[in-house]
């Protein structure tokens, strides 16, 4: 039987490479059993992991899988950075890996390219 | 069912490029993780990289300044092209998908055999 | 990198019997609060089927006589009894650190 602890599964050392002006879902893939843990967003600044408030979060249930999103709506150039989630649970804070997204502006960019020729950089 | 399909050719020369495909169905490549994985004539199975749901890559430094990955989401297709072959590349080549739940990988491709021969 | 370490390289184990395969890390596996080794079977020409992952879930379809235990370095795969089906190479893979690392395999036959 599987074990009912929560866990956060955003990869270690993970990174997206987005484009300012495109919508983007930054997923927590969170693992729980029968109740849902809280979930927050953060935005590191150094060493500290700033709370994102109100900010368009949602679930997302898929196969037997749950993701808790953080939508950017646009992406901005400020949401360069990384990100981490957490759940509290049974009075616990368990905390995700970081994740970095990086931010091309498109004004910057002479040509923009695909989301796929980005991939192979 | 979710199904993986390699294709390339089973014979390429010294010094010449390696490109492979891999062809999904029953899931979405913008979804999970798609990776490259070999297994050498000794039984040795080495993972090769990474491509991710929103395209970013990751690539064994082992191999990182011969190998890409690139995928095209309208074909649901991802790409190993890996440059500079050598003989030790002769291997048997997977590609696989990773859970988000631990990144175990679940489902498996058939597997290519590739020779370096000239 | 994470070297996984498998003991013994070969088995040989009476039908009805227990195999026992271990996998040892170079570096504790744990490092998303869950331990992230996982266990394929190979057989001559398929490629790799999971078998366990997370160090001790059985994934689906798999007969209970697979189990696996263990935890931060030291990792076991236990199949009881051993069937002739069960020929195999198998091997341990984990997946908490960049690159994923597999062990060297193990080939079980029957005595």
């Known amino acids: 039987k599987e074990s009912c602890d929560v866990q956060l599964y955003i990869k270690r050392q993970s990174y997206h490479s987005i484009f300012a002006g495109d919508p983007f879902k930054l997923e927590c893939p969170v693992k729980y059993c029968a109740h849902r843990p809280q979930v927050t967003w953060c935005k590191l600044n150094g060493t500290t992991c700033v709370k994102l408030e109100g900010r368009h979060t949602s679930w997302k249930q898929e196969k037997n899988l749950s993701f808790f999103i953080l939508h950017f709506e646009p992406v901005l150039p400020s949401d360069n950075g990384s990100y981490r989630c957490s759940a509290n649970f049974l009075s616990a804070i368990i905390e995700s890996h970081s994740t970095t997204l990086y931010v091309t502006d498109v004004k910057s960019a002479s040509e923009r390219p695909s989301k796929d020729e980005m991939a192979s950089r | 069912e979710v199904q993986l399909q390699e294709s390339g050719p089973s014979l390429v020369k010294p010094s010449q490029t390696l490109s492979l495909t891999c062809s999904v169905t029953g899931d979405s490549i913008t979804s999970a993780y798609w990776n490259w994985i070999r297994k050498f004539p000794g039984n040795k199975l080495e993972y090769m990289g990474y491509i991710s749901y929103s395209g970013s890559t990751y690539f064994n430094p082992s191999l990182k300044s011969r190998i890409s990955i690139t995928r095209n989401t309208s074909k649901n297709q991802y790409y190993l092209q890996l440059n500079s072959v050598t003989t030790e590349d002769t291997a048997t080549y997977y590609c696989a998908r990773s859970h988000y739940y631990g990144y175990y990988f679940d489902y498996w491709g058939h597997g290519t055999t590739l020779t370096v021969s000239s | 990198d994470i070297v996984l370490t498998q003991s013994p390289a070969s088995l040989a184990v009476s039908l009805g019997q227990r195999a026992t395969i271990s996998c040892r890390a170079s570096?504790?596996?744990?490092?998303?609060?869950?331990?992230?080794m996982h266990w394929y079977q190979q057989k001559a020409g398929q490629p790799p089927k999971l078998l366990i992952y997370r160090a001790s879930n059985l994934e689906s379809g798999i007969p209970a006589r697979f189990s696996g235990s263990g935890s931060r370095t030291d990792f076991t795969l236990t199949i009881n009894p051993v069937e002739a089906d069960d020929v195999a190479t198998y091997y341990c893979?984990?997946?908490?650190?960049?690159?994923?690392?597999f062990g060297g395999g193990t080939k079980l036959e029957i005595k």
């Open positions: 570096e504790t596996i744990d490092s998303y609060g869950d331990s992230l």
């Open positions: 893979q984990q997946t908490d650190e960049d690159p994923y690392t």
